[in-house]
């Protein structure tokens, strides 16, 4: 089992849509794949993929997930808020008849405010 | 020490309800697939539920739809709750713990068992 | 349903000698992951099943070398290279490769 996630870095407007892909290789056949996306080690959803079906849609505040058979696993936030800045991280398991589990490597979201005054504060913020 | 305690089995009548408990201690509940086995009075093992470390179930379509199983990782707890029971339901009612984090479907440790009769 | 058949149905044996016992399943048990999932479980007197073999032929912990599991498919087969007398009890065979994961009916030990 491996993961492939992308982008490594994703810069959207506060408003905009964010698109968030997550590639699951299995070679062998699985009756349930688990995935999970997390934002900063905290988890968005953990849902199930039966039979080329997602068990939900939603994964945290406005986001919303797709499976595209054979691998793809898509979250898509829209709207964008600044809240929604942060690392993503994809994760996926198949449990039976063995626990064989995988994850992608981090996609880091930055939000731009619409303001762009509020942007430059934001930047000035920051030590150094 | 592993240890698995059932507790909840008694007599019930044909189309009622029972809650079996499964109190587990010795390991970090959180990291293994648990599971419920049933040995019915003079018979061999059957497989009746599982649970795996992040939720996910699966049983077996005789007891789909009768059958719930749950977990409380907080209370390092497994639970079953049974409804719609059958006389065919009569067993002892094992928890058994997955033989290790990656092992599911393979079970390692198992409690004493406890009595559930269906008759009226 | 996988239907695993386990022979004999009862075995006398005699301490210090050698022991077979025989599991066939209704299909093969190899996932599409290339493992095997067949197991072996003990159910002596008066207690709870306790794994002694996992995946074919990998002993649990703790349990003592004179147990071995073999086969490949559909055909399996536990040997005990010389019996003890704590070794009576129930053994059963169990696959975990397809869903609904089955046991056999169980092969009586018994001392002579």
């Known amino acids: 089992l491996s993961v492939q996630q992308g982008p490594n870095l994703l810069q959207v407007r506060q408003g905009s849509q964010a698109t968030l892909v997550c590639q699951v290789d299995q070679a062998t056949a699985w009756e349930r794949l688990r995935v999970k996306w997390t934002k900063d080690g905290a988890i968005l959803c953990q849902p199930y993929i039966t039979n080329g079906s997602l068990s939900l849609g939603v994964c945290g505040p406005q986001g919303r997930l797709s499976w595209q058979a054979p691998s793809h696993l898509t979250l898509q936030l829209d709207p964008v808020s600044l809240n929604h800045s942060g690392a993503y991280v994809c994760w996926a398991a198949v449990e039976i008849p063995e626990l064989e589990e995988a994850e992608g490597n981090i996609t880091r979201l930055f939000v731009d405010p619409d303001d762009p005054t509020q942007n430059r504060n934001r930047i000035a913020s920051f030590p150094g | 020490e592993v240890q698995l305690v059932e507790s909840g089995g008694g007599l019930v009548k044909p189309g009622g309800s029972l809650r079996l408990s499964c109190a587990a201690s010795?390991?970090?509940?959180?990291?293994?697939?648990m599971s419920w086995v049933r040995q019915a009075p003079g018979k061999g093992l059957e497989w009746v539920s599982s649970?795996?470390?992040?939720?996910?179930?699966y049983s077996p379509d005789s007891v789909k739809g009768r059958f719930t199983i749950s977990r409380d990782n907080a209370k390092n707890s497994l639970y079953l709750q049974m409804n719609s029971l059958r006389a065919e339901d009569t067993a002892v009612y094992y928890c058994?713990?997955?033989?290790?984090?990656?092992?599911?479907?393979?079970?390692?440790?198992w409690g004493q068992g406890t009595l559930v009769t269906v008759s009226s | 349903d996988i239907v695993m058949t386990q022979s004999p149905l009862s075995l006398p044996v005699t301490p210090g000698e050698p022991a077979s016992i025989s599991c066939r399943s209704g299909q093969s048990l190899v996932h599409s992951n290339a493992n095997t999932y067949l197991h072996w479980y003990l159910q002596k007197p008066g207690q709870s099943p306790q794994l002694l073999i996992y995946?074919?032929?990998n002993r649990f912990s703790g349990v003592p070398d004179r147990f071995s599991g073999s086969g490949s498919g559909t055909d399996f087969t536990l040997k005990i290279s010389r019996v003890e007398a704590e070794d009576v009890g129930v053994y059963y065979c169990s696959q975990s490769t397809h869903v609904p994961w089955t046991f056999g009916g169980g092969t009586k030990v018994e001392i002579k």
């Open positions: 058994a713990r997955g033989a290790d984090y990656y092992g599911t479907s393979w079970f390692g440790n």
């Open positions: 649970i795996s470390q992040g939720g996910g179930t």
């Open positions: 995946k074919v032929s």
């Open positions: 010795g390991f970090t509940f959180s990291s293994y697939a």
